[in-house]
C-alpha cells in the first residue's frame, strides 16, 4: 500500500483499542454532485430483468433504511414483452459498509458492519453444471 | 421513526461536536454468512449487458479499494451473441457510505462520505422523448 505521513494535527486517541476504534464525523459529505437522480430511477421498470424495491428498515443501523431489489421474474423480458425462461433474471449484489449501534441503542457508539445488498437485476444466460 | 431507549451502558462522549462525532469500532462484523461468492462472480461476463470492473483506489478512504462497473457495449447482447443497438446497456448505480480520513492522513479520524458507484449493468428498452 501507499505510506502517507501522519498529519501532526490529528486528534489523539485515548481508546485502549486504538486503532480499531476511531472518531467519525457523521456530517455526511456528498460527493455525488453531478448526478441526475432521474437517470436510473426507472431502470427497475424498463430493464429486461425488471425488479421491485423493498424497504429494509433497522433503527440500530446507520443508514437505517436500505432498499433491496428483488427480481420480478425467473426469466427475462424478450422483444415481444413476454418472459423468456431460457434466460435468468438475477440480482446484482454488492457488499456495503453500514454502522451498527454497539452496544445496542447507543447514540454515539458504532461498529462497522458489512452487509450484502441486491442493487438491481441483470439478465444472464444460464450455464450447465455437470455433477459427476 | 422508532424511539429506542438509551442503553445505560453506552460510552460517554466528551466531544464538543457530539452527536455528530461518534466512536466507531473498525473491527468489521460480516453479516454475509449464508452467501456464496460463486453466485454472482461471473455475471459481468454472462449478462446480456456485460461489464468490466475497474479498480478505484484511494488511501484516504475506507475502504481504500472500490470496484466500479463499466458497461462493455452501448447495446445489449442478443440470442445470436451480437450487440443489439435497439436496446441499451446501462449501469446500475448505488449510493454507498465510505469513511474519508479527516483531517487528511489521520489514522484515527474520519468523516462519513456518500459516493455513487456503478455495481453492474442491466439491459433497458430506450424510451423516446419528444421535444415540442
Amino acid at each position: 500500500g501507499i505510506t502517507i505521513p501522519r498529519n501532526p494535527g490529528c486528534p489523539n486517541s485515548e481508546d485502549k483499542n486504538f486503532p480499531r476504534t476511531v472518531m467519525v464525523n457523521l456530517n455526511i459529505h456528498n460527493r455525488n454532485t453531478n448526478t441526475n437522480p432521474k437517470r436510473s430511477s426507472d431502470y427497475y421498470n424498463r430493464s429486461t430483468s425488471p425488479w421491485n424495491l423493498h424497504r429494509n428498515e433497522d433503527p440500530e443501523r446507520y443508514p437505517s433504511v436500505i432498499w433491496e431489489a428483488k427480481c420480478r421474474h425467473l426469466g427475462c423480458i424478450n422483444a415481444d414483452g413476454n418472459v423468456d425462461y431460457h434466460m435468468n433474471s438475477v440480482p446484482i449484489q454488492q457488499e456495503i459498509l453500514v454502522l451498527r449501534r454497539e452496544p445496542p441503542h447507543c447514540p454515539n457508539s458504532f461498529r462497522l458492519e458489512k452487509i450484502l445488498v441486491s442493487v438491481g437485476c441483470t439478465c444472464v444466460t444460464p450455464i450447465v453444471h455437470h455433477v459427476a | 421513526g422508532i424511539t429506542i431507549p438509551r442503553n445505560p451502558g453506552c460510552p460517554n462522549s466528551e466531544d464538543k461536536n457530539f452527536p455528530r462525532t461518534v466512536m466507531v469500532n473498525l473491527n468489521i462484523h460480516n453479516r454475509n454468512t449464508n452467501t456464496n461468492p460463486k453466485r454472482s462472480s461471473d455475471y459481468y461476463n454472462r449478462s446480456t449487458s456485460p461489464w468490466n470492473l475497474h479498480r478505484n483506489e484511494d488511501p484516504e478512504r475506507y475502504p481504500s479499494v472500490i470496484w466500479e462497473a463499466k458497461c462493455r457495449h452501448l447495446g445489449c447482447i442478443n440470442a445470436d451473441g451480437n450487440v443489439d443497438y435497439h436496446m441499451n446497456s446501462v449501469p446500475i448505480q448505488q449510493e454507498i457510505l465510505v469513511l474519508r480520513r479527516e483531517p487528511p492522513h489521520c489514522p484515527n479520524s474520519f468523516r462519513l462520505e456518500k459516493i455513487l458507484v456503478s455495481v453492474g449493468c442491466t439491459c433497458v428498452t430506450p424510451i423516446v422523448h419528444h421535444v415540442a
Partner: antibody, heavy 123, light 107 residues
Amino acid sequence: EVQLVESGGGLVQPGRSLRLSCAASGFTFDDFAMHWVRQAPGKGLEWVSGINWNSGSIGYADSVKGRFTISRDNAKNSLYLQMNSLRAEDTALYYCAKDIAAAGEFYFDMDVWGQGTTVTVSS
Amino acid sequence: EIVLTQSPATLSLSPGERATLSCRASQSVSSYLAWYQQKPGQAPRLLIYDASNRATGIPARFSGSGSGTDFTLTISSLEPEDFAVYYCQQRSNWPPTFGQGTKLEIK
C-alpha cells in the same frame, strides 16, 4: 453418491394438506435450483414447481398456483412442497429433481431425480 | 402453453436396430428441448439437453437433433436396457412442458 430422497406422501382427503420433503446428498445443495415434477398413475410427467438456490426466484404451474408452496432449507440440504386444498387430480407420484444450471439458476432441465413419493387424494 | 406431441406412441424394435423417436412442438422452441428415459418403477433420466447435447454418462449411441418445432432422438443400435418410455421436454416458454411419451418395446 448423488442422491435425492422424497418423503411425506400418503393418502389424504380432498381439501386437506400434505407436506413433502426431499433430502439431498452427494452434491453442494445450494449450488442448484430444485424442482418438483409429478406423474399421475399411468400418465406422463408434469412440472409442478421450481426454486432457485436462495429462494429468491420461485415458479409454479398454473394447476397448483395458490395452493402449493415450494421452499428449501440449504442448511439442512432439504427441499419441501407444502400442498394445501388438495384435489383428486393432484393424485400422483411426486419427484424431487435437481436443475442442471450452475450458480443456482434455472435451466429447467433436470439431471438428478429421486425415486418419488406417492400422494393419493381420495375420500 | 406449448404442446409437445411425440410419435409414434409405441415403437416395437429388436436389439441392434436403430430407433428414431420424434417430438413436435406446437410452436418454435428454438433448441431448448431435452429428452428423458424412464424405465418401469424408476425415475426419469436426462439423456439429451438443448436438442443435441448428451448429459453426463449417457452412451454415445444416443443422439438428438432438430430445432424450431421438429426434433428427433436417435438410438443408433438398441441395447436390451434401452427399452423404456422416452419423454421430450421444452424449456423455451412458460411453463416447461413434457410430451406424452413414446414407449419403446422389444419386438
